[in-house]
């Protein structure tokens, strides 16, 4: 029974493997891996891909087996599969393996990225979409705006990202986001880098205002120079010969 022989495709259908309380947990949490067969089984095996011998066995005459991982460490994270068998299948014959379950044991999730779609410059009346992208599916994403203590928006997403829509008129500002596991025990990511959203016309009007100031100053300088030249010319006509300013 130690070495499962690979049965022909579809011969004994695969079981399903799930984790309680979650597939992403902090170190020290007790995790239960539940293997559920599509029929009553006799023995269940928990496997780590690439290893021939099962990590754990459970002999239960039922369709469900639970494997207990106590106070998990980051080293216990990784890929798991389970198989089941029945005594009437013959020695060493196991079911097809379950789909891989990825168990992640970490204090903190990787930092997400925050980008603006289509870009960080907003036209008048146009909406902008902010995409907070992590690395894990089925997470809850939170968007923050600088200067506002409470989260601006929440999104639960089956994808490893979430899109937040900002209305054009209120869009300009500085934003950041993070994501976390959807249920306790919560594991949080680091905050993303900040993203600045600005008006499309606010930048150009700043340039115009600046240019007007520069033009005004240039005009004043020219008028001043002109006055000085006129004054100098008149002064030369009255001055004694040989004397130059």
């Amino acid at each position: 029974d130690i070495t499962p022989s690979v049965p022909p495709a579809s011969y004994h259908p695969k079981p399903w493997l799930g984790a309680q309380p979650a597939t992403v947990v902090t170190p020290g949490v007790n995790v239960t891996l539940r293997c559920r067969a599509p029929q009553p089984a006799w023995r269940f095996g928990l496997f780590k891909p690439g290893e021939i011998a099962p990590l754990l066995f459970r002999d239960v005459s039922s369709e469900l087996a639970e494997f207990f991982l106590e106070e998990v460490t980051p080293a216990q994270g990784g890929s798991y599969r389970c198989c089941y068998r029945r005594p009437d299948w013959g020695p060493g014959v196991w079911s097809q393996p379950s789909d891989v379950l990825e168990l992640l044991v970490t204090e903190e999730l990787p930092r997400p990225s925050l980008v603006a779609l289509p870009g960080p410059v907003v036209g008048p009346g146009a909406n902008v979409s902010l995409r907070c992208a992590g690395r894990l599916r089925n997470m809850s994403f939170v968007l923050y705006r600088e200067g506002v203590a409470a989260p601006l928006q929440y999104r639960h997403s089956a994808q490893p990202w979430a899109d937040f829509t900002l209305l054009g008129a209120r869009a300009p500002g500085t934003y950041s986001c993070y994501y976390h596991t959807p249920s306790a025990p919560y594991v949080l990511s680091q905050r993303s880098e900040v993203l600045v959203i600005s008006w499309e016309d606010s930048g150009s009007s700043d340039y115009t205002r600046g240019n007007l100031v520069r033009l005004g100053l240039a005009g004043l300088v020219l008028i001043s120079l002109g006055a000085l030249v006129t004054f100098d010319w008149r002064s030369q006509n009255r001055a004694p010969a040989g004397i130059r300013p």
Epitope: S10, H12, P13, P40, S61, S62, E63
Partner: antibody
Framework: QVQLQQSGAELARPGASVKLSCKAS????????INWVKQRTGQGLEWIGE????????YYNEKFKGKATLTADKSSSTAYMQLSSLTSEDSAVYFC??????????????WGQGTPLTVSS | QILLTQSPAIMSASPGEKVTMTCSAS?????MHWYQQKPGSSPKPWIY???NLASGFPARFSGSGSGTSYSLIISSMEAEDAATYYC?????????FGGGTKLEIK
């Protein structure tokens, strides 16, 4: 949508055999067990057996071994149950039902409409 | 084989009344499933995996239990709930059903 369409009512003589059919549609036939359930008039439900169409593997209630034979034809997505050596005790409505076969659900999630079988001389 | 005993076999309830029916297993099972059947119709999946209500069915129904003791509860009886309810286990071969609880409206 998932559907299990069973063959029509049968009238058979004692000692004869009959073959009931259950045509599946709306899902991948080879992914789920098909079960057969017996219900005599005014009585409860009795599980006969199940077949996994992907492999043809069958599991029977000991009580029905030798009485019922389960088969499946993948090309037509149809499951069959043959009942042999019929007696009046076999008069009943026979249902086919699909096993949900999901991590979060393990009941019989879809049922056929039933085939009434009457055994009479 | 696992014997499932349902009680009561027959019961009646007035509209708005709370209804509780039980299913006792001769050995421990992982999950209990419940079906509703009306005369001349196929059984309908009603509650699966002990406590999950099948989609499209009224929230006044709930299921609970573990091990060998399970129950189906209707918080407020309605006329359309009159039917026979069967419990069912798939934890051990042969799969078995309870004898049914026939629920009538007063």
């Amino acid at each position: 949508q998932v559907q299990l369409q069973q063959s029509g009512a049968e009238l058979a003589r004692p000692g004869a055999s009959v073959k009931l059919s259950c045509k599946a549609s709306g899902y991948t036939f080879t992914d789920n067990y098909i079960n057969w359930v017996k219900q005599r008039t005014g009585q409860g439900l009795e599980w006969i057996g199940e077949i996994y169409p992907g492999s043809g593997n069958t599991y029977y209630n000991e009580k029905f071994k030798g009485k019922a034979t389960l088969t499946a034809d993948k090309s037509s997505s149809t499951a069959y149950m043959q009942l042999s050596s019929l007696t009046s005790e076999d008069s009943a409505v026979y249902f086919c039902a699909r096993s949900a076969n999901r991590y979060d659900r393990g009941d019989f999630d879809y049922w056929g409409q039933g085939t009434p079988l009457t055994v009479s001389s | 084989q696992i014997l499932l005993t349902q009680s009561p076999a027959i019961m009646s309830a007035s509209p708005g009344e709370k209804v509780t029916m039980t299913c006792s297993a001769s050995s421990s099972v992982s999950y209990m499933h419940w079906y509703q059947q009306k005369p001349g119709s196929s059984p309908k999946p009603w509650i699966y995996d002990t406590s999950n209500l099948a989609s499209g069915f009224p929230a006044r129904f709930s299921g609970s239990g573990s091990g060998t003791s399970y129950s189906l509860i209707i918080s407020s009886m309605e006329a359309e709930d009159a039917a026979t309810y069967y419990c069912h286990q798939r934890s051990s071969y042969p799969y078995t059903f309870g004898g049914g609880t026939k629920l009538e409206i007063k």
